[in-house]
Structures are given as C-alpha cells and as structure tokens.
C-alpha cells in the first residue's frame, strides 16, 4: 500500500499523517529516522507472514531459498500534478523477524540515488512478527525538473530489493525549448523561423503571430517551422504555445529588412602632407547588413578641370584611409560612401582638404667649386632651381660635402639661407678629394641633390683648382 496526495504543510511532523500500510498495532508508536541515516533496524521480534501484495524482489540468492521472500508493498504508480504544487509519496516494506541483517531504505530517481537534503523520513513500526518500514518522500512546490521515476532500494540479508517505480509527472504551461530568433532579411526573400515548446501535458500546439495578428489559421503541432515568403517592411514575430494548462507566448523578435546603408558622417582630415591626405569617417547605419567596403571620392576643388573624380576603395574597417599620389599645395573635395550586400550608400557631405607644400622637384644648377688656398676654404656657387608654386617657398639649401683621403672619410653638411647662391666651406683635409652636392629646401621639405662635383685638395702650398658646371654623373673635374 502507498499514498500520494497534495499537501500544504511544511512541518515534518505534519507531513505524513495519511493512512499507513500493513497491520500496525495501535499500542506501538513508530520511531523515525531521517532519509540520510543508514541506521540498523531495531532488534527482530517474532516472525510473521509476508503480506499478499508485494513487488517481487529483483535479486535472488541461494540464502533466499531458506527465508520467505521480502518485497516492497505495491504503491501508487503514477502521480500527475501541476507545477508549484506539493507532493508526497512513500514506499513500505514488512520485514519478518527471521531476517537478521537489514540496511536503511534509500530513494532513487531515474537510476540515480537521491543524496543530500531531500524531504524524506523513514518510520519504523515494530510488532511481535517483525517490523514495518515506511519511507516517506515529499517535494515542495514541484518543478519540471522533478519529473521522473522514483523508487526505493533496501538491502535485506545482503540482497538488494527494489520497489516498483512511482512516476511523477509535473504538468504546467508549455515551456519553450526553442524560440524564434531575430534575423535581418532581404526584401521579398523567404526565411524560416522555428518555435518549439514542450509540456507535459502534451500535445503542445503552436500559433505564429506577426505584428499582433495570427498567421496560421489552425494550430501546428510543436515543433513548428514558419516559412515567411518575404517581407517588404520590418515585422515583429512571436509564437504562442498552447496545451491543456494554458498558453505561453515567446519573446517577440524583430525581422528587419536589409536596405542600403546610410551615408557616412563626420568625415574629417586627420593629417595632410604634400602628396597625401589621411581621412576618417563615422559609418552610417549599416542597413541591417554588415558594411563590406567603402569608397573615397576625391576631386580637385580649385581647378577648371573636367570634374573627374578619383575613386579609392578600401575595406569598411578601420574607418580611415590615406589618399596618396595627390598634387602638392592643392585643394580637394572629399566624400565617402560605403556598401553592404544590398548596395552603396549615398555619399557623405563633401569636405574641403588641402595638401601642403611639396619639396622641390629639381636640384640647384650650374654648381662650381673653387679652392681658395690662401684662406683655406672652398668657394661654392650655384644657380637657383626653377621651383614651381606647389613646391612651396624656398627657404634655403643643404650642401653635402664628403672628404676622402688615404685612410680618412668625413661626411658633412651645411644649411644656408635662400639669400644668394654662394657659400664658403673651410677645408677639412688636405691631400684629399672633396665631393659636393647641393639640394634646395622649401617648407615642404628637401629636394633632390645635384650631381656630385669633385675637387682635389692638394697638400699645403700646391694649388689644384676644379671649376665645374653640374657635371654628368660620375664625372670628376680636376686640374
């Protein structure tokens, strides 16, 4: 015999006041042990016959032939209740005095022993024939995870006895195990949404909802896949799961329609050089589709040109690009556009940017070098190179002079202001060759060096002189 009922009390002494199995004399007060104990039973008393309705033992041994069989009494097989209700059930067994060795009753669920803090107690009812043992189990506020097959185990004379299972079925509202997920879709292109909910109780039926309206006229058995043939505007989808206990509604998910991106904003110039501009931007809204690449459009702003636009393509990230091969000291209009799988955004607002002065593109001309031995100096002269406007304003010259003699090498340079085209350099080493090169300097930088001009510096009081125009490369003029 066994009992199962709903209960509200929480006091342990009130938990198990239902009818008890077996023949129990009224003068015997039971004593109880918590589930976790493995106490031995009280000393056996007089033998008694085995109750008629029992579960058959699952293990046999040679010794068992000498003793009457012992098994758990039949109990309730299936308990159905709603979530958050309380439940209690029990196993009971009658042990005749002829059994000398018994261990406590353990509770198992779905093949695993229930250890730890469970609401369970074991009660013993001894009489002259033996002892009746009742193992009581309770669950307060049942949850779905409490669903399963519960049974008792006990060792008697080293033989394991297992009770019939008590199947606990916790019923509640449908529970979602798969809800629809937000997706971004191409306009008028089919896509799928999935919804799956479970009981118990089963079956669970699904209704799909789009923008608060049901889209299936009849319910679908869970799981349900909704194929939407295409949307032209953003929609919100959810699914309703119905079973005999009621209705659960999934989260609502936005299905967005992919569109072209918004134009980039905040186009800024981070740095300019004579021939490059470093531009940054903030991407616009991506149109629900990742940006794939961006295009930087550049046109000359201050020319009566044909309006041709240079286009530079770059990856969408980082939002930065160095535009190169530009003219020095020029004004440009710059805009940015980005694309996703749907197409290109409109261009950003155009911004103005300027390159800085360039360095000179040609070297000084007609370089001559004379040795003034009396003053022990080199007299260097040149003519100003033809500097274009975009090369910037001439600020001076750099003179490189390299001195070489047996075992000695000296490389020196001087900078002179733009006033004049003449300089004097003290002789560094006698009995040596001096190689002179000159470059023009503007605010934009230093230009190319002239071809080298060589002069031989004799020992003291011997004069060799080497005038020169800019010679061909590798030419050495000396006298």
């Amino acid at each position: 015999g066994g009992t199962a009922e709903k209960w509200e009390e929480t006091e342990l002494d009130q938990l198990f006041s239902g009818p008890l199995p077996g023949r129990l004399p009224v003068n015997h007060r039971p004593f109880s042990a918590p589930h976790s104990s493995r106490d031995q039973l009280p000393p056996p008393q007089t033998g008694r016959s085995h109750p008629a309705h029992t579960a058959a033992p699952q293990v046999t041994s040679t010794a068992s032939k000498l003793l009457p069989p012992v098994a758990f009494n039949h109990t309730i097989g299936h308990i159905v209740l709603s979530e958050h209700k309380n439940v209690k059930f029990n196993c009971s067994i009658n042990i005749p005095n002829t059994y000398q060795e018994t261990a406590g009753i353990s509770w198992w669920k779905d093949g695993k022993e229930l250890l730890g803090a469970h609401h369970s107690i074991t009660q013993f009812y001894p009489d002259e024939e033996g002892v009746s043992i009742i193992a009581l189990f309770s669950i307060a506020s049942v949850q779905r995870s409490d669903n399963g097959s519960y049974f008792c185990k006990m060792k008697v004379n080293n033989r394991e006895i297992v009770s019939d299972p008590i199947y606990v079925e916790v019923q509640g509202l449908p529970y979602f195990i798969k809800q629809p997920e937000s997706v971004n879709v191409t306009r008028n292109t089919a896509f799928n949404l999935t919804c799956q909910a479970v009981g118990p109780p089963e079956p669970v039926n699904i209704f799909w909802v789009q923008n608060s309206s049901r889209v299936n006229e009849k319910p679908e058995r869970s799981p349900s896949v909704l194929t939407v043939p295409g949307l032209t505007e953003t929609a919100v989808f959810s699914c309703e799961a119905h079973n005999d206990k009621g209705l659960t509604v999934s989260k609502g998910v936005h299905i967005n329609i992919k569109v072209i991106p918004s134009p980039p904003t905040e186009v800024h110039i981070l740095n300019s050089t004579a021939h490059s501009i470093l531009v940054s931007w903030v991407p616009g809204f991506d149109g629900y589709s990742p940006l794939q690449n961006c295009s930087i459009q550049v046109k000359e702003a201050d020319r009566l040109s044909n309006g041709s636009v240079m286009v530079f393509n770059t990856s969408a990230s980082p939002h930065l690009y160095e535009i190169q091969q530009l003219q020095a000291l020029a004004n440009y209009s710059i805009a940015v556009s980005c694309r996703n799988e749907i197409g290109w955004s409109a261009v950003s607002p155009w911004i103005l940017a300027s390159t800085t002065e360039g360095a000179p593109s040609v070297a000084p001309l007609n370089i001559t070098v004379f040795l003034n031995e009396s003053n022990n100096i080199l007299d260097i002269r040149w003519t100003k190179p033809p500097i274009k406007r975009q090369d910037g304003e001439l600020v001076g010259y750099r003179i490189s002079h390299v001195w070489e003699s047996a075992g000695t090498y000296k490389e020196l340079s001087e900078e002179v202001s733009q006033n004049g085209s003449w300089a004097q350099i003290p002789v560094q080493i006698h009995n040596a060759t001096c190689t002179v090169r000159i470059a023009a300097i503007t605010k934009g930088g230093i230009g190319p060096f002239s071809e080298p001009v060589n002069i031989i510096i004799p020992e003291h009081s011997k004069v060799d002189y080497a005038p020169s125009s800019t010679p061909a490369p590798g030419n050495t003029d000396s006298m």
Partner: antibody, heavy 120, light 107 residues
Framework: QVQLQQSGPELVKPGASVKISCKAS????????VNWVKQRPGKGLEWIGR????????NYNGNFKGKATLTADKSSNTAYLQLSSLTSEDSAVYFC?????????????WGQGTPVTVSS | DIVMTQSHKFKSTSVGDRVSIACKAS??????VAWYQQKPGKSPKLLIY???SRHTGVPDRFTGSGSGTDFTLTISNVQSEDLTDYFC?????????FGGGTKLEIK
C-alpha cells in the same frame, strides 16, 4: 509530390444532386485547407468555399450557401463537394485546390477539374 | 466582397518582349494576392503568391509586384508557351475573389 485527383465528369438532370470527390496525396491532408472553385465555360473563377479536414471546419462563399456542402474523410484523404438542386447555371468545371493554413499562402496545387453538365 | 479588376481582357505582345498585366483591388488587400496561369482545358497553375513570391518551379521571367490595391504581373522575355490566360486573386478576406482574367496573345 502533391497531387489532387478528382472524380470524373458528371451528367445530371435538373433538380438532382451530385457529389464529386478530390483525393489528396503527397502531403499532410489533415493540416491544409481544401478549397473548391467553379469555372463556367469562357468565364472567370469563382470561389465556392473551403474545408479543414483536421477538424471539419469550413467556410462558404455566401453565393453558394444552400447550394454546396463540403465534407472530408481523413481516413481516405478525400474531400467532397456536394451540389444540390442543380440548374443549368451549375454547369461548370469544379476544381479542388489545396491551401496551407498559413495566411501567406494560397491555392498552390489544383486538381484536374471535374466537369458537371446539368441537362434534361 | 472585394472586387478584383483586370482592366485588359486581352493583351498583345511578341515573343521576347516584356509585358505587364495589371490587377486592381476594390479595397486594400495588403500583399495577399496571387497570380495564376491557365492553359485551355487545364487547371490553373500558381505563379506568384504573397504579391511577389515566385511559386516553386516557376521561371524567373515571371515577377509580381504591388501592395494595397494595385498589383502587376510582369513577364520578361515572353515565350510562346506564355501566350494564355492569367488571373489574379485576393486571399485577404472571405470570400476569396478572382479577377476576370487577361488573355495574352501574339501581336
């Protein structure tokens, strides 16, 4: 593949009734609506009504109430259209057609049509 | 009942041309519109549903567009087998209603 096989041509007398059938295969018969459509010679298409075999739910075009009765037998995957009190106006080809229970979809597969001729 | 009007009972075209067939609903039907092709002595065949979705196996030269009350079936690169009857249908509200049909014929 989805197929709707209709019964053969019918020649009936005015005032009589006729019951034509539509046997479905290749899909879950119980969970799609079976619709019936009338087409008179040289005319357009006229929707008669529909039935949901899963639960017997049905809807009718008001013009056919009292004229048409829709039924379905889940065990044989067959839907039926019964026309009563026939007149020459009922001479037409009658089509059955499937519709999913999702609102996006419409009559995606059709039977071959059953010609009904009402003549004395 | 919602009335579906196909203004052209006949429409002339040539093989290889692009042709459009119009259909107008008497009230807003959203995108719950289908297009069917019917050849003589045959049952209608679904081409387009949900105003612009092509049914399985329908060649991509058939395109549907529109929403609300105005709908168009466009056939690009018309083939000789396309020269037949076309019907529009609304399935937004009961009873479902069909247009009167447009016969596509050779110029």
């Amino acid at each position: 593949q989805v197929q709707l096989q209709q019964s053969g041509p019918e020649l009936v007398k005015p005032g009589a009734s006729v019951k034509i059938s539509c046997k479905a295969s290749g899909y879950a018969f119980s969970s799609s609506w079976v619709n019936w459509v009338k087409q008179r010679p040289g005319k357009g298409l006229e929707w008669i009504g529909r039935i949901y075999p899963g639960d017997g739910d049905s809807n009718y075009n008001g013009n056919f109430k009292g004229k048409a009765t829709l039924t379905a037998d889940k065990s044989s995957n067959t839907a039926y259209l019964q026309l009563s009190s026939l007149t020459s106006e009922d001479s037409a080809v009658y089509f059955c057609a499937r519709k999913s229970h999702f609102i996006y979809y419409t009559l995606d597969y059709w039977g071959q049509g059953t010609p009904v001729t009402v003549s004395s | 009942d919602i009335v579906m009007t196909q203004s052209h009972k006949f429409k002339s075209t040539s093989v290889g041309d692009r042709v459009s067939i119009a259909c107008k609903a008497s009230q807003d039907v959203g995108t719950s519109v289908a297009w069917y092709q019917q050849k003589p002595g045959k049952s209608p065949k679904l081409l387009i549903y949900w105003a612009s979705s092509r049914h399985t196996g329908v060649p991509d030269r058939f395109t549907g567009s529109g929403s609300g009350t105005d709908f168009t079936l466009t056939i690009s690169n018309v083939q000789s087998e396309d020269l037949t009857d076309y019907f529009c249908q609304q399935y937004s509200t009961y009873p479902y209603t069909f247009g009167g049909g447009t016969k596509l014929e050779i110029k």
